[in-house]
């Protein structure tokens, strides 16, 4: 049940008042400073007012400090993502200070409860920091709160309570029920940090959302589009259907944000990227993988700061296991002209050729409709690092691969009986990568052969003037 | 050092139930969960649930949910496992275990207590 | 739940040889990998936690790899107290599960 004192209650204090029977009552929040990577290490306990433990335990007062927030738990064990985040930390920041936040007692309740219990862990937390500012050397500059789940609004509470502002809030798929379309002081938002970087991975548009839709942060990152995680489906997951349920796969999408951050820690010669666009469907549509402007960055601990006036909502693909970085290409096709086009939208598949690795075939997904006489714009990515482009091979799949192409091709032919046969005419192909801001335009191998039709495909190579730079900086000079 | 003491075997009939207890020293009982494990003869080990002993939270293997409760006295440091509705198959070594920090691995195990269900 | 694998329910290896075991999970669980060593009539020991992390008292003589779903214990000189028979656990989703056991017997 909800701890039962006012929104501005002190959880100690509540807490520590000696009951007429002198019983020791037990704080309901616990901050567990992590001394070792050894998970068999009892870690140290600190607590407002007690000095002793931050000198026994070595916590250093010049270095960041990281509060790992869990969110609200079916279990009264933590879940396995802690263990893993919290040793990414200490091997990437080794001096740093890695404190976990255990409010389980609070946490393993209903979970309208436990929301209920959010304000007042965030003021413990706020609380806890406020001591520590006490101290000398210590600035809440070098504070970075990492919230999972229901832990992102404790931690938007802490920000808010705190005197001052801490450094960095990273929101790790907040929660979504009880907080979507709440007002800016009862969830996440980005007057709660110097710097609030959020990453969505569990948003559903119907059915109920674990995670938040609406951008909460200076930056919301919705990686593959901030739904469907790939690895996470049904077959992935259950691997047999009689050993799992739904559950998992709702584990699974909903914690990726923990393993997507663990993977920026423990990666860093492998950083993933994202793009700012207004909505997944036009990133689907390649449209938008520009760095100018600030409009890319890096996921997860290596994100640059950004403070801007909007929130930026950003994304970008993934893999279905780390390492999770992709290689983003916007593939930009001019169809000038075509023929007998009927009502079926071709299915295209690309394969890249570089001068490190050639692709696997990759389909261009078609997100409205292929227009003529236009450019038509589109995303494929692959999952290794293909070098410099050398050529390109565009095949237009032959056969109908579902029961509603095929009723649409007999009905063409019902109202088209003598159908000449379906063409594109395609002279060329301009790729961008949206990992390295390089353009490149392909052109026909045969100049004169620009037609392609079901079952057949076009080669593409690298035209006469080459790549092409426009003022873009690379994502991979610029960011750390 | 850290000790996990076990109550003594048992010997049920089935239908009954029989309660476990895990006497834990060596170390701060409240900080660490506590897990029961058993083993049928011949059979791979099972793990059942686990206890928080600082505020008394459980998990619980769904296979066992409806027949097993874990419980602890804090001040006592002991965990108990009680299981009902026995039957022929509850036949087993049961075991406590101590969790790591975030409660994945067992350093330390109690000794075992054998579970025998027989009419 | 997830289902750990140990495809050899028996392997046969002589004193100061190397014993490669194995163990595969069902489904991807990163590091979440823990090994035990149990001899008749005695409790499980501990080897190896989260995959390849040594435990202290443990003879460095056993090690462990492997992320995802592929994971491998190897003894590299066995001595005598080594023959037993070896599990792998997994604490990547409840409920925690353990593989079926290998018996290392004396060749």
């Known amino acids: 049940s909800p701890v039962p004192f006012g929104p501005e209650g002190r959880l100690e204090d509540k807490l520590h008042k000696p009951k007429a029977t002198q019983t020791e009552v037990k704080p309901s929040v616990r901050f567990n400073l992590r001394t070792s990577k050894d998970p068999e290490h009892e870690g140290c306990y600190l607590s407002v007012g007690h000095s002793q433990p931050l000198e026994d335990c070595s916590f250093n007062m010049t270095a960041k400090t990281f509060f790992i927030i869990h969110g609200w738990t079916m279990s009264g064990i933590f879940e396995n993502w802690l263990h893993k985040l919290v040793s990414a930390l200490h091997t990437r920041e080794k001096d740093a200070n890695v404190v976990v936040v255990d409010w389980l007692p609070l946490a393993h309740q209903l979970y309208t409860d436990a929301v209920n219990n959010t304000r007042v862990v965030g003021h413990s937390i706020a609380r806890m920091l406020d001591w520590l500012q006490e101290k000398d050397d210590f600035s809440l500059g070098n504070v970075h709160l990492i919230g999972y789940s229901l832990g992102a609004h404790v931690a938007g509470y802490a920000g808010n309570f705190v005197k001052g502002t801490v450094g960095r809030i990273t929101g790790l798929d907040p929660a979504g029920p009880m907080f979507e379309g709440a007002d800016i002081h009862k969830r996440l938002s980005p007057d709660d940090a110097d710097f609030v970087d959020v990453l969505h991975t569990y948003t559903r548009s119907f059915g109920l959302s674990i995670g938040i839709q609406m951008p909460v942060g200076h930056i919301d990152i919705y990686p593959n589009g901030g739904d469907f995680q790939p690895g996470c489906g049904l077959n992935d997951v259950l691997g047999s259907i009689a050993y799992g349920t739904i559950t998992e796969v709702v584990k699974c999408e909903h914690e990726r944000a923990v393993h997507l951050f663990v993977d920026s820690l423990v990666n860093q010669d492998k950083p993933s990227f994202a793009f700012q666009c207004t909505d997944s469907n036009r990133f689907k549509k390649g449209i938008c993988l520009s760095c100018r402007k600030n409009r890319c960055n890096s996921i997860g601990y290596n994100a640059k700061k950004m403070r801007n006036k909007r929130n930026s909502k950003m994304y970008l693909k993934t893999r279905a296991g780390m390492p999770f970085r992709v290689y983003h290409y916007q593939m930009k096709i001019h169809v000038f002209s075509y023929k007998n086009m009927g009502e079926i939208e071709p299915t295209f598949y690309v394969t890249l050729y570089g001068t490190n690795a050639d692709s696997q075939t990759l389909p261009l997904e078609i997100v409205e409709r292929i227009e003529q006489n236009a450019t038509n714009t589109f995303l494929v990515y692959t999952e290794e690092d293909l070098g410099d482009l050398l050529k390109i091979q565009l095949t237009w799949e032959g056969a109908s691969q579902s029961w509603y192409n095929l009723w649409k091709e007999f009905r063409s032919y019902l109202s088209q009986p003598r159908n000449p046969g379906r063409e594109l005419n395609i002279r060329r192909i301009r790729v961008k990568s949206g990992e390295t801001q390089r353009k490149l335009t392909f052109c026909t191998e045969d100049p004169e052969n620009t037609s392609i039709s079901p079952g057949r495909e076009l080669w593409f190579r690298k035209c006469r003037d080459g790549w092409r730079m426009k003022n873009e900086t690379s994502p991979t000079v610029e960011l750390p | 050092q850290v000790q996990l003491v076990q109550s003594g075997a048992e010997v049920k009939k089935p239908g009954a139930s029989v309660k476990v207890s895990c006497k834990a020293s060596?170390?701060?009982?409240?900080?660490?969960?506590m897990h029961w494990v058993r083993q049928a003869p011949g059979q791979r080990l099972e793990w059942m649930g686990g206890i928080n002993p600082y505020y008394g939270g459980t998990t619980y293997n769904e296979k066992f949910k409806d027949r097993v409760t874990i419980t602890r006295d804090t001040s006592a440091s002991t965990a108990y496992m009680e299981l009902s509705s026995l039957r022929s198959e509850d036949t087993a070594v049961y075991y406590c275990?101590?969790?790591?920090?975030?409660?994945?691995?067992?350093?330390?195990w109690g000794q075992g207590t054998t579970v025998t269900v027989s009419s | 739940e997830i289902v750990m694998t140990q495809s050899l329910a028996t392997l046969s290896v002589s004193p100061g040889e190397r014993a490669t075991l194995s163990c595969r999970a069902s489904q991807d669980i990163s590091n979440s990998l823990h090994w035990y060593q149990q001899k008749p009539g005695q409790a499980p020991r501990l080897l190896i936690y989260y995959a390849s992390q040594s435990i202290s008292g443990i003879p460095a003589r056993f090690s462990g790899s492997g992320s995802g779903t592929e994971f491998t214990l190897t003894i590299s000189s066995l001595q005598s107290e080594d023959f037993a028979v070896y599990y792998c656990?997994?604490?990547?989703?409840?409920?925690?599960?353990f593989g079926q056991g290998t018996k290392l017997e004396i060749k």
């Open positions: 656990q997994q604490s990547n989703s409840w409920p925690y599960t």
């Open positions: 060596g170390y701060t009982f409240t900080d660490y969960t």
């Open positions: 275990a101590k969790g790591d920090y975030y409660g994945g691995s067992y350093n330390y």
